[in-house]
């Protein structure tokens, strides 16, 4: 059984795989940063297991994570964001496994929002726009965005477009007429920070016009 022995014998705990992954979110709540960690193995018995971060902190040596169901979480202004911190899984005072991590290399941006698509009849195109909270941030301002769209009936045939701006034009002739499309967007740090893709934005759905038979163009 996963987990450590209740009688204080740590042998069982040492046999378990306590590998974990973390991501940071900078200025996620005003000037506060967050750090989220979770075990790779969803079946790890997390009873009595704690996470702690030490080093590269302001005014304190170490900070303890709060446990929220299966994830471990810190929200604080105390990340120096310079150099490496040591993140450890602990049981009592004993460290089971640790990782040295620079928090600026595991940044996960916030998901883009307000995604919308406007059809321009005269231009025969669709203007895709979305917003990101990162435009207002001090640190993670430069992002690469991944816009993905598909015809709703094509379950797994997503077309991806990478862009650094928050506006994209899709040409009408590249899309099927009279079809329903789903579109969504996510972001990843680009320049100065490294990390992971954000969650996807909520999807937006739009319909392409029908073909006008006389001209061969879409209505």
């Amino acid at each position: 059984e996963s987990g450590y022995a209740q009688n204080g014998d740590l042998e069982d705990a040492e046999l378990d795989d306590y590998s974990f992954s973390c991501y940071s979110q900078l200025e996620v709540n005003g000037s506060q940063h967050s750090l989220t960690c979770a075990f790779e193995d969803p079946d790890v018995n997390t009873t009595n297991l704690e996470f702690e971060i030490c080093g590269a902190l302001v005014e304190v040596k170490c900070l303890n994570f709060r446990k929220l169901q299966e994830i471990y979480f810190i929200e604080t202004k105390k990340f120096l964001l310079i150099g490496k911190s040591n993140i450890c899984v602990k049981v009592g005072e004993k460290s089971l496994t640790c990782k040295k991590i620079d928090l600026t290399t595991i940044v996960k941006p916030e998901a883009p929002f307000d995604l919308s698509v406007i059809y321009r009849e005269g231009a025969n195109d669709f203007v895709v726009t979305f917003n990101t909270s990162h435009l207002q941030k001090k640190y993670v301002k430069v992002l690469m965005h991944d816009v993905a769209y598909r015809q709703e009936k094509d379950e797994n045939k997503w077309t991806h477009v990478n862009l650094s701006s928050t506006k994209l034009t899709l040409l009408q002739r590249k899309l099927q007429p009279a079809a329903m499309y789903e579109i969504k967007v996510r972001s990843i740090p680009d320049h100065y920070f490294k990390g992971f893709w954000s969650e996807w934005s909520p999807s937006y759905y739009f319909r392409t016009p029908e073909i006008n038979n006389s001209s061969g163009e879409m209505d």
Epitope: C54, G55, I82, G83, K84, D102, T105, H191, Y192
Partner: nanobody, 118 residues
């Protein structure tokens, strides 16, 4: 074997400026934090400024905030300290350090001497 070499020190008038450089031969330079410290005669070494691996994040001590600027050029494996409005109390040996790992700087240079005359 020499891994961090500081340069740019010298004698300068109060109110003047100097730019210190620190060249690293450490292979992980572009992913390491860098810092500048100074040791005044008869005093302990004190932290002045630090910069993250990409240059996006900097941190300064209160004593130099607004007067000193730390920057880096990862293509040249070099970190800089631009020092303006120098005061006599800025006199000392200036050291650069590399790889801030769990509150310990792993590598140190030999230092360069700065003298500010009033």
């Amino acid at each position: 074997e020499v891994q961090l070499v500081e340069s740019g020190g010298g004698l300068v008038q109060a109110g003047g400026s100097l730019r210190l450089s620190c060249e690293s031969s450490i292979s992980t330079f572009s992913s390491d934090a860098m810092g500048w410290f100074r040791q005044a005669p008869g005093k302990e070494r004190e932290f002045l400024a630090a910069i993250g691996w990409s240059g996006a994040v900097t941190h300064y001590s209160d004593s130099v905030q607004g007067r000193f600027t730390i920057s880096r050029d990862n293509a040249k494996n070099t970190v800089y300290l631009q020092m303006n409005s120098l005061k006599s109390e800025d006199t000392g040996r200036y050291y650069c350090a590399e790889d801030y790992d769990t509150d310990v700087w792993q590598y140190w240079g030999q230092g360069t001497l700065v003298t500010v005359s009033s």
